[in-house]
């Protein structure tokens, strides 16, 4: 006779579209017109989507809108000519939740808004796996955004300033299916937008500890008091942050108790009571506390009876100030080297000239910093072409 | 008894459209798909596709895609199949037949296209 | 889409004769096929589903089975109403495929 398999005594479904699944075994295999379902009311379903496996038979059958009044009962049916098997199982409908206030806006800025999601109380079942906080611009016709929130309290920030956005609360329970209807909808504008950021904006290394960010003065078109407001983080130690107050008479700040050789991310604006709108971030590191490492990838190329092209790579992070290229004829005294000082570190290749032809020189590569000088490992060979070969 | 009568045979030109009609009988007709199957003359069966009557939902095969349109009538238990842009090559028996791997068959229409 | 190739496309027989029909698959479809029978002037009629299932009715001298991708139509002792068309069908996966068929006819 047929079996049914693997068909729990219980399931728990979400309202909406639901898609059970009969499996049968046995022989022959059971036919889709000799599998059913039957709701708790009676009403007899026929597979929606069928197919055989070596061993089994399963039935799809699809309920377009489940509703908790389908709660109850349900019975897999299987009809062969081996036999007929009944299986039941309990089937409950859960009602997807949704919240019953709409969200509260706590603080907005130009850019940003606090929101308190007031996601409890909800109509419907829980319990809620996740929450997402919908919003939009009334006037735009795109498609809601929305955000997973865990706390209550969640910020939206890159709003745009003095725009009226549309708020809602989606609560998502478990199982498929799970996200509920939004709930009520709130309305808020974000403020006007602030003062600009400071002008002529730059952050220069100081000293191993220390950066100093300059601007130009700031003359405020308003009696409002005004003061400049300065971000700075680490780009390698997230959780170091500092933001700095300073007075708004003042064009600069110095930026101490760094740590050595590390990149840092600063901003800035002008806050009077509104805040103003954040500078594009700088970026700088502070001075080194060892010598650089060596230039790397050093090639030599282009050499002709005269001249050769070298170029290299250096790291970041080191505050190279120069490369020096040191060359000279192999075998002559040490002191007959010429020295070529490139003071731009971010020049990476360099032609050699007023070389003599078909002669070997020995080419030294540094690098230099506050600290001093890298060490090079090995010299690197240059043999001039003889005169004519030359191209 | 599951019963399946189609409609009588069609002679339509090149570029024209044709609708045939299967009428079911015997059994719960939402419940089970309908599939259209042809067979040109002296020749093998072929899929076209199929139609669940209790919400529409088709199924076509992608060679037929853009010529066929498979509709259906809850009152009186009945489904069509339209083929349009016809051309001499659909000249064809085509078949209505009941669940997802036809387990019962209308008894044909001939559709003849002909200039 | 999955070519099914069946053979032979005609087969001359006699009554209590055995035959085999076999469809070849070019590519892995599980156990989804069907044989289905055409009669002149009938209606087409299913004789096995799931590969080796018998359809409800249908005469025990039928019988499917499967090697690899090969799958074979076995009719133990021909009668006369066994005269006819065959097709084999796949429906692993869409579109549908079937068989070029096979004339059975009588020697």
């Known amino acids: 006779t047929p079996k049914i398999e693997d068909l729990p005594d219980h399931i728990e479904v979400n309202t909406g579209k639901f898609n059970p699944i009969c499996k049968a075994s046995g022989w022959p295999l059971p036919a889709n017109e000799e599998m059913t379902l039957v709701k708790p009311d009676g009403t007899v379903l026929h597979p929606k989507d069928f197919n055989h496996t070596e061993n089994f038979s399963v039935a799809i059958f699809t309920i377009h809108r489940i509703l908790p009044l389908d709660s109850g009962v349900w019975v897999c049916s299987v009809n062969t000519v081996a036999g007929m098997v009944e299986k039941p199982f309990n089937i409950s409908v859960k009602v997807l939740p949704k919240p019953l206030n709409a969200p509260n806006v706590i603080d907005t800025g130009h850019n940003f808004a606090v929101i308190n999601i007031s996601s409890e109380p909800y109509f419907g079942d829980g319990p809620i796996k996740s929450k997402k906080l919908l919003y939009k611009p009334v006037n735009d016709y795109e498609a809601w955004r929305h955000i997973q929130v865990t706390n209550e309290i969640v910020t939206l920030n890159y709003l745009e300033p003095r725009t009226e956005y549309e708020l809602c609360v989606q609560l998502i329970r478990r199982g498929e299916g799970g996200e509920g209807h939004p709930g009520p909808v709130r309305r808020f504008t974000t403020a006007s937008i602030g003062l600009p950021p400071p002008q002529g904006l730059i952050l220069l290394p100081k000293s191993q500890t220390t950066l100093n960010l300059t601007w130009q003065p700031i003359f405020p078109s308003s009696e409002d008091d005004f003061y400049v407001e300065v971000e700075r983080r680490s780009v390698q130690i997230k959780s170091d942050q500092q933001n700095i107050k300073v007075p708004g008479n003042l064009t600069s700040v110095l930026l101490n108790n760094l740590h050595p050789r590390e990149q840092y991310v600063v901003r800035a604006r002008v806050n009077t009571k509104a805040q103003g709108e954040w500078s594009e971030d700088l970026t700088a590191w502070t001075l080194s506390d060892i010598v650089p490492p060596q230039p790397e990838n050093i090639k030599i190329s282009n050499i002709t009876d005269s001249s050769a092209v070298i170029s290299w790579t250096i790291l970041d992070g080191y505050s190279i100030s120069s490369i020096i290229i040191r060359y000279k004829v192999q075998g002559k005294n040490e002191d007959q080297h010429i020295d070529v000082k490139i003071k731009n570190a971010t020049i990476t290749q360099y032609q050699l000239k007023g070389l003599e032809p078909e002669t070997a020189y020995q080419v030294d590569m540094f690098a230099e910093n506050n600290i001093g000088s890298s060490n090079p490992a090995f010299s690197h060979e240059l043999m001039t072409l003889p005169e004519s070969q030359a191209p | 008894e599951v019963q399946l009568v189609q409609s009588g045979a069609e002679v339509k030109k090149p570029g024209a459209s044709v609708k045939v009609s299967c009428k079911a009988s015997g059994y719960s007709f939402t419940s089970y798909w309908m599939n259209w199957v042809r067979q040109a003359p002296g020749q093998g069966l072929e899929w076209m596709g199929m139609?669940?009557?209790?919400?529409?939902?088709?199924r076509l095969n992608q060679k037929f895609m853009d010529r066929v349109t498979m509709t259906r009538d809850t009152s009186t238990s009945t489904v069509y199949m339209e083929l349009s842009s016809l051309r001499s090559e659909d000249t064809a028996v085509y078949y209505c037949a009941r669940g997802l791997y036809g387990n019962s068959w209308g008894q044909g229409t001939l559709v003849t296209v002909s200039s | 889409d999955i070519q099914m190739t069946q053979s032979p496309s005609s087969l001359s027989a006699s009554v209590g004769d055995r035959v085999t029909i076999t469809c070849r698959a070019s590519q892995d479809i599980g156990i989804s096929l069907n044989w289905y029978q055409q009669e002149p002037g009938k209606a087409i009629k299913r004789l096995i589903y799931a590969t080796s299932s018998l359809d409800s009715g249908v005469p025990k001298r039928f019988s499917g089975s499967r090697s690899g991708t090969e799958y074979t139509l076995t009719i133990s002792s021909l009668e006369s109403e066994d005269f006819a068309d065959y097709y084999c069908?796949?429906?692993?996966?869409?579109?549908?495929?079937f068989g070029g068929g096979t004339k059975l006819e009588i020697k």
């Open positions: 139609i669940h009557p209790s919400d529409s939902e088709t």
């Open positions: 069908l796949q429906y692993a996966s869409s579109p549908y495929t």
